[in-house]
Amino acid sequence: KVFGRCELAAAMKRHGLDNYRGYSLGNWVCAAKFESNFNTQATNRNTDGSTDYGILQINSRWWCNDGRTPGSRNLCNIPCSALLSSDITASVNCAKKIVSDGNGMNAWVAWRNRCKGTDVQAWIRGCRL
């Protein structure tokens, strides 16, 4: 599923991401935009043999199990395919674990490069939340 901007903002808010670990909802929507272009089925392969999955491009080396990433830690204890569902529950729950890990949203390269220090509230402006 490819979410609309406000549709995703509403879904993320429903799942408790607004101000989760101090990160406003705009940060999460911005991260999803630049990680996956709001596409729940996005997959991207990395040079280390791992793959990133879903709307927040969660990595199989650390967070989920795709059955083929050497040394996978699977810290969210889920199959990576669960992160590709049109229901974003699994992605949100895993993202909460990631953002609590010490580096905050710096774990997402796209957030660091494209969202951090910008007017992220623009990503939820005009949305009825």
Epitope: Q41, T43, R45, T47, G49, D66, G67, R68, T69, P70, P79, C80, S81, L84
Partner: antibody, heavy 116, light 107 residues
């Protein structure tokens, strides 16, 4: 136990298309990538590409882009590979395998012969 | 693409001999190297995964070693059922690639 059952041998004319199937049993089909591999005598094994049935995500070896197309039907736990514009170079045995990085589980292979 | 070069192309041995098959990668692939055995008209069978881990049900006479670019499959005291083709495969990057194979034949 995990099993991959491929469709039977095919004899096709040049220029035609063929669709090979791979039915998976014994595991959660949507969770693992399915890989496709080509084997021709004297050419060894070649990786064609892969599909993640749960999402339909696909990756292709550059060499097979435009030649192979992958699809999957999660209701029947079956992956498909369509090969188009067939030539004699496509005559080979085609295998599906479960994509565990290494391939512990293979189909029995589908022999494709392209001949006028 | 990562190229895998296997040597020798053919190995003629007597049952009871011990043999080593080589697989060399064109660049470092850590331990992401797997070995397969294939008999005529059969699918490949996984022997060794991640350079040195024996796959389920594989006899202890098969062992693997190596890391980086140089890998070895060793068969301690070859048995008649071991004859066939042996392939290596890398899963370090895409596209996945296979070696050209080593044929193990009876002398």
């Amino acid at each position: 136990q995990v099993q991959l059952q491929e469709s039977g041998a095919e004899v096709m004319k040049p220029g035609a298309s063929v669709k090979i199937s791979c039915k998976a049993t014994g595991y959660t089909f949507t969770t693992y990538w399915i890989e496709w591999v080509k084997q021709r005598p004297g050419h060894g094994l070649e990786w064609i590409g892969e599909i993640l049935p749960g999402s339909g995500s696909t990756y292709y070896n550059e060499k097979f882009k435009g030649k192979a197309t992958f699809t999957a039907d999660t209701s029947s736990n079956t992956a498909y590979m369509q090969l188009s514009s067939l030539t004699s170079e496509d005559s080979a045995v085609y295998y599906c395998a479960r994509g565990d990085g290494n391939y512990c589980y293979w189909g029995q292979g589908t022999t494709l012969t392209v001949s006028s | 693409d990562i190229e895998l070069t296997q040597s020798p192309a053919t190995l003629s041995v007597t049952p009871g001999d011990s043999v080593s098959l080589s697989c060399r990668a064109s660049q470092s692939i850590s331990n992401n190297l797997h070995w397969y055995q294939q008999k005529p008209h059969e699918s490949p069978r996984l022997l060794i995964k991640y350079a040195s881990q024996r796959a389920s049900g594989i006899p202890s006479r098969f062992s693997g070693s190596g890391s980086g670019t140089d890998f070895t499959l060793s068969i301690n005291s070859v048995e008649t059922e071991d004859f066939g083709m042996y392939f290596c495969q890398q899963s370090n990057s895409w596209p996945r690639t296979f070696g050209g194979g080593t044929k193990l034949e009876i002398k």
